[in-house]
């Protein structure tokens, strides 16, 4: 969370940004809020990126002004125009790429004053893991798969029954490069699993952490997955 202040005459305006993460190959959002101003035509929003000449996006007088926009952002950016009056200056970015990572500045000017705040935008790939029972193996084993990660994550297994146990000796993890030659498929196999136990497969890099849980009993298999972005907010 970064809060910036600005002075215009005697007026301070607070601009707040949140460290954000973008999943490459999807649309992303760079979050920025400011003190609301009901006079939409008096609001100017400028997004800038460190090391880039020209603007990422500009919104003023109630509409986009893309005349100074840098080529790498052409056709890819939007503010949430209907939310600007309530203080939302967040930027939507289409088809996030690794090269979009960096330091961005959200600059705001309103009738109350002006201010800005920086935002660190991280880009990578993250996806939900899916755990299945691998019946092909000679002994009962679990297979945890996640289709897209970057940078290369760490993978760890945990068990509800054997809390604190180290499963590195009885698991095997591989990373297979996907066709676009950036992201990788993560596959981890845990051997010698026991029935009536809940196992967790945890995949983590510096952008996201995902966990897949599986409970295998004699009568059923229960699964649950969750994903959280790290250092955001």
């Amino acid at each position: 969370l970064i809060i910036g202040f600005g002075i215009s005459g005697k007026h301070f305006i607070t601009v707040t940004t949140f460290t954000s993460a973008g999943n490459i190959g999807e649309d992303g959002t760079l979050s920025c809020t400011f003190e609301p101003d009901i006079k939409l035509n008096g609001i100017v929003i400028q997004w800038l990126k460190e090391g880039i000449k020209g603007l990422v996006h500009e919104f003023k007088e109630g509409k986009d002004d893309l005349s100074q926009q840098h080529e790498m952002f052409r056709g890819r950016t939007a503010v949430f125009a209907d939310q600007v009056v309530v203080g939302n200056a967040s930027l939507r970015l289409k088809n996030v790429q690794l090269t979009d990572a960096g330091t961005y500045t959200c600059y705001i000017r309103t009738s109350k004053g002006k201010g800005n705040a920086n935002l660190e935008y991280k880009t990578g790939a993250f996806s939900m893991p899916e755990i299945n029972v691998d019946y092909n193996a000679s002994s009962e084993s679990l297979r945890c798969e996640a289709p897209r990660w970057f940078p290369q994550p760490t993978v760890a297994w945990a068990s509800q029954v054997d809390q604190g146990a180290n499963f590195s000796e009885v698991s095997n993890t591989s990373f297979e490069l996907n066709s676009e030659n950036v992201t990788m498929k993560v596959v981890s196999v845990l051997y010698n699993v026991t029935i009536n136990n809940t196992y967790s497969c945890m995949i983590e890099n510096d952008i996201a952490k995902a966990t897949g849980d599986i409970k295998v009993t004699d009568s059923e298999v229960k699964r649950r997955s969750q994903l959280q972005l790290l250092n955001s907010g």
Partner: antibody, heavy 116, light 109 residues
Framework: EVQLVESGGGLIQPGGSLRLSCAAS????????MNWVRQAPGKGLEWVSV???????DSADSVKGRFTISRDNSKNTLYLQMNSLRAEDTAVYYC??????????WGQGTTVTVSS | EIVLTQSPGTLSLSPGERATLSCRAS???????LAWYQQKPGQAPRLLIY???SRATGIPDRFSGSGSGTDFTLTISRLEPEDFAVYYC??????????FGQGTKLEIK
């Protein structure tokens, strides 16, 4: 040369299934947002489905639960699996690439006719 | 859902004249996400303008786009015989993800 070539269209009875294919050349399908857009006879363009670079998909309400977009990265090919077809699905189906700058590459289209 | 309404439905003009086609959105659309296409009978659509005002590769400079917010315009400064076709505006980014206008037919007077 950047190109998209659709195939798989034809005459099908209501309730039937069909799979359309779109072979891409000159670029990598998985790096782009790939779409299916259709055009009923004498009508305008209607977006059907998208598959993002990430592999996530989205579809128009009119086809949700019936049509599934997918891709085979090794074949650099886009697909549209169409189930429970209705007369109102009759159209020319185009695949189209969105390279951030709008739908900049289109296939020639393949015709789907749903009729008994 | 954002609805794009194009006007006029049909525009009858002669070669050499100026054509002005309008696209109005039911709510604000980002200029970045507004595009124009040309479609001739029996052919696939062709991207003309993206980002409301940027010409796509290979598009002649007689085609220009303008506008922001809810009102967008495609202008053809001097009509050539090959310009007579149907023109569609399209937006990206809301639900449904892509929305097209109903089209404007540009015909020879």
């Amino acid at each position: 040369e950047v190109q998209l070539v659709e195939s798989g269209g034809g005459l099908i009875q209501p309730g039937g299934s069909l799979r359309l294919s779109c072979a891409a050349s000159g670029f990598i399908v998985s790096r782009n947002y790939m779409n299916w857009v259709r055009q009923a006879p004498g009508k305008g363009l209607e977006w059907v489905s998208v598959i993002y670079g990430s592999g996530r998909t989205d579809s128009a309400d009119s086809v949700k639960g019936r049509f599934t977009i997918s891709r085979d990265n090794s074949k650099n090919t886009l697909y549209l699996q169409m189930n429970s077809l209705r007369a109102e699905d009759t159209a020319v189906y185009y695949c189209a690439r969105d390279a951030d700058y709008g739908l900049d590459v289109w296939g020639q289209g393949t015709t789907v006719t749903v009729s008994s | 859902e954002i609805v794009l309404t194009q006007s006029p439905g049909t525009l009858s003009l002669s070669p050499g004249e100026r054509a002005t086609l309008s696209c109005r959105a039911s709510q604000s659309v980002s200029s970045s996400y507004l595009a124009w296409y040309q479609q001739k009978p029996g052919q696939a659509p062709r991207l003309l303008i993206y980002g409301a005002s940027s010409r796509a590769t290979g598009i002649p400079d007689r085609f220009s786009g303008s506008g922001s917010g809810t009102d967008f315009t495609l202008t053809i400064s001097r009509l050539e015989p090959e310009d007579f076709a149907v023109y569609y505006c399209q937006q990206y980014g809301s639900s449904p993800l892509y929305t097209f206008g109903q089209g404007t037919k540009l015909e020879i007077k």
